[in-house]
């Protein structure tokens, strides 16, 4: 449309503006979770809060079961951050006692999920080997890219070990979406 | 408003429709910082260029004392990257000493003050333990999301330490924030 | 604009408003480099897939030979992520062999070509040291941000190291821009 | 499966003390914050307090009425928690439950044990 | 600290009956950390309801629960003769953690 100016004429136009402030949007924070257990090579999703603190949701981009859930299709900027913290990572213990020295990783995945297609397409990785020397090691993971989503798609973050989530602060770890 | 076209008619409609380059804009840069004294656990906030080379404020987003000002109330999109670098660090001082070898950590806040509201709201927060074996290390932390804010809200930057902050290029360290 | 309405009225009025469907558009994902021969500080250029999966181009943003053109002047939001591997960091080897302890890092550079200027400049750098104790190591560096950019710049990544860039999948090294 | 067993409630006379234990198995105990719960004769269920784990320091918390008497500790080597009570009360007649925390999420309650105090 | 309201103290209901218990909370809980008890006499408490509005393993789909910011609600949309017995909710999202009172549920 370049160089089309939206004029107002007596002819019925129909031109696709809406205004910006209508636009799905969300911004989601961590809320508090421990697995009980986790099944190997399989990332659990992480719930998150979507109504209190600097949390939100609107314009019928609705949050649910640990999806956020697309109301209209479009590009849509999507990004998380999850920080991770833990004790000695195993790679520092296994250092030590002088084996050899794979190291630990974590990992934050953003997963599309479309009900008509049979698996979930990962849109976007961060992952990190862990050597740490330190006791205690923390650190973010940030992700975030442009895609072109479908109405009904559903938005959820995997990570490698929720056990390994910093929990304790909304501007640590978040997850939010909106309509370009 | 999905569905709803923006057609040209005779009577006034008053629809929220507005100009994309007309909405508050900026991109700050690095600049050398003045270590200033600040209080135990007071993160000192960084200071930015705001209109040589890359940087720039625009549409009534202005840049003062340390302060990004919001001019008018909407959902932002607001980022930042700090790039830290230092020598060896105490904690890796400590291992050789066989002490406890307790991290030391680099640590970015996005904070946002509004004047009728007594504390300072922690917007995005990164934060990584540094326990570097080399002698020479640097790495950066980036951080960013999306917040409504309100007219006259201010937005700066925190650092656990202003004098491990990488000042000696525009694009290692920067500042932004616009209008969605 | 603020507090100016965009009501229709008989008199021809030109308001540069838009379709934020039409604006231009891209994301690219990563494929395997062929390392090319390039000269000592010069960081060589990835290459990206531009249509097939994860990747797109839209509304006359284009990619040819490594470069995203840029179709209309305007602010751009600009990003990438590179995920690096590699076995362990020559610092490690030489820190074993008792020698003083210099780094390595993997640095990531979103660069502008304007063919009026003589000089890319450097838009964006991400720069890490990597001082890895594990033999095998992984990490992403993440960049993104808002820049004023002119009809027919040019946009491209480049890397400190192409063979240690993870091609492996699409969601673990991207680049892309939209105009705000 | 998830378990948890109480055990060491009894009869106590006012003034003494007494140290409930709760053996854990089924999950990963040292990533799960743990409470203690408990329930007066024909009342309504009172929290008594929490530990988190290791990672979030360890630290502990309590409603007022045990603040100062009662301490919470947890061994995750043993998959154990504890829960030492000193200079006890009638009012602390209760049956007392231990349940994970492990915020969102389902939740385990051990059957309670009961203790007694009275002159 | 949080007090949390239950109404009514007591329901009368007839199996076959929908039941819709009410929680207010004094100040806003997440409804991550809203959760839902059945007791009956010399039993531990079974948790039903998670996360406002999450059934726990095994509850089953007569049992559910909404609400959200201060006021929650807990509906069994047909009553078994198994339901009747003391339903509480709870928040754990600030200390100290708090308990509603109870609502008992009687046969009518």
């Known amino acids: 449309l370049k160089g089309q100016e939206f004029a107002p004429s007596h002819q019925q136009v129909y031109a696709p503006l809406r205004a910006d402030g209508d636009k799905p949007r969300a911004h989601l924070t961590v809320v508090r979770q421990t697995p009980t257990q986790h099944f190997k090579n399989q990332f659990p999703a992480l719930h998150w809060e979507h109504e209190l603190g600097l949390a939100f949701t609107k314009n019928r981009m609705n949050y649910t079961n640990k999806f956020l859930l697309i109301p209209e299709s479009g590009d849509y900027f999507i990004y998380s951050q999850v920080t991770f913290r833990g004790m000695t990572s195993e790679c520092s213990e296994i250092r030590q006692a002088g084996r050899p020295n794979k190291p630990d990783s974590i990992t934050v995945v953003i997963t599309k999920v479309t009900d008509s297609y049979p698996e979930p397409t990962q849109l976007l990785m961060g992952t990190k080997s862990v050597c740490e020397v330190g006791s205690n090691w923390f650190q973010p993971i940030y992700l975030g890219a442009m895609f072109s989503l479908q109405e009904g798609d559903k938005l959820m973050v995997n990570v490698s070990d929720i056990s390994l989530v910093d929990y304790t602060k909304e501007d640590k770890t978040f997850f939010g979406a909106f309509l370009l | 408003l999905k569905g709803q076209e923006f057609a040209p008619s005779h009577q006034q409609v008053y629809a929220p429709l507005r100009a994309d380059g007309d909405k508050p804009r900026a991109h700050l840069t690095v600049v050398r910082q003045t270590p200033t004294q600040h209080f135990k656990n007071q993160f000192p906030a960084l200071h930015w260029e705001h209109e040589l080379g890359l940087a720039f404020t625009k549409n009534r987003m202005n840049y003062t004392n340390k302060f990004l000002l919001i001019p008018e109330s909407g959902d932002y999109f607001i980022y930042s990257q700090v790039t830290f670098r230092g020598m060896t660090s105490e904690c890796s001082e400590i291992r050789q000493a066989g002490r406890p070898n307790k991290p030391d950590s680099i640590t970015v806040v996005i904070t946002k003050v509004t004047d009728s509201y007594p504390e300072p709201t922690q917007l995005l927060m990164g934060t990584k333990s540094v326990c570097e074996v080399g002698s020479n290390w640097f790495q950066p932390i980036y951080l960013g999301a999306m917040f409504s804010l309100q007219e006259g809200d201010k937005l700066m930057v925190n650092v656990s330490d202003i004098s491990l902050v990488d000042y000696t290029k525009e694009d290692k360290t920067f500042f932004g924030a616009f209008l969605l | 604009l603020k507090g100016q309405e965009f009501a229709p009225s008989h008199q021809q009025v030109y308001a540069p408003l838009r379709a934020d469907g039409d604006k231009p558009r891209a994301h690219l994902t990563v494929v395997r480099q062929t390392p090319t021969q390039h000269f000592k500080n010069q960081f060589p250029a990835l290459h990206w897939e531009h249509e097939l999966g994860l990747a797109f181009t839209k509304n006359r943003m284009n990619y040819t030979n490594k470069f995203l053109l840029i179709p209309e002047s305007g602010d751009y939001f600009i990003y990438s992520q590179v995920t690096f591997r590699g076995m362990t960091s020559e610092c490690s080897e030489i820190r074993q062999a008792g020698r003083p302890n210099k780094p390595d890092s993997i640095t990531v550079v979103i660069t502008k070509v304007t063919d009026s200027y003589p000089e890319p400049t450097q838009l964006l750098m991400g720069t890490k040291s990597v001082c890895e104790v594990g033999s095998n190591w992984f990490q992403p560096i993440y960049l993104g941000a808002m820049f004023s950019l002119q009809e027919g710049d040019k946009l491209m990544v480049n890397v400190s190291d192409i063979s240690l860039v993870d091609y492996t999948k699409e969601d673990k090294t991207f680049f892309g821009a939209f105009l705000l | 499966e998830v378990q948890l067993v109480e055990s060491g409630g009894g009869l106590v006379k006012p003034g003494g003390s007494l140290r409930l234990s709760c053996a854990a198995s089924?999950?990963?105990?040292?990533?799960?914050?743990m409470n203690w719960v408990r329930q007066a004769p024909g009342k309504g269920l009172e929290w008594v307090g929490r530990?988190?784990?290791?990672?979030?320091?360890?630290?502990?918390d309590y409603v007022a009425p045990v603040k100062g008497r009662f301490t919470i500790s947890r061994d995750d080597s043993k998959n154990t928690l504890s829960l030492q009570m000193n200079s006890l009360k009638t009012e602390d007649t209760a049956v007392y439950y231990c349940?994970?925390?492990?915020?969102?999420?389902?939740?385990?309650w051990g059957q309670g044990t009961l203790v007694t105090v009275s002159s | 600290e949080i007090v949390l309201t239950q109404s009514p103290g007591t329901l009368s209901l007839s199996p076959g009956e929908r039941a819709t218990l009410s929680c207010r909370a004094s100040?806003?809980?997440?409804?991550?950390?809203l959760v839902w008890y059945q007791q009956k006499p010399g039993q531990a408490p079974r948790l039903l309801i998670y996360?406002?509005?999450s059934r726990a393993t095994g509850i089953p789909d007569r049992f559910s629960g909404s609400g959200s910011g201060t006021d929650f609600t807990f509906t069994i949309s047909r009553l078994e003769p198994e339901d009747f017995a003391v339903y509480y909710c709870?928040?754990?999202?600030?200390?100290?953690?708090?308990f509603g009172q109870g609502t008992k549920l009687e046969i009518k």
């Open positions: 349940i994970t925390d492990r915020g969102w999420g389902e939740n385990y």
């Open positions: 089924g999950f990963i105990f040292s990533n799960v914050w």
């Open positions: 530990i988190k784990s290791k990672i979030d320091a360890g630290t502990t």
């Open positions: 100040q806003s809980v997440s409804s991550s950390y």
């Open positions: 996360g406002a509005s």
């Open positions: 709870q928040q754990y999202g600030g200390s100290p953690y708090t």
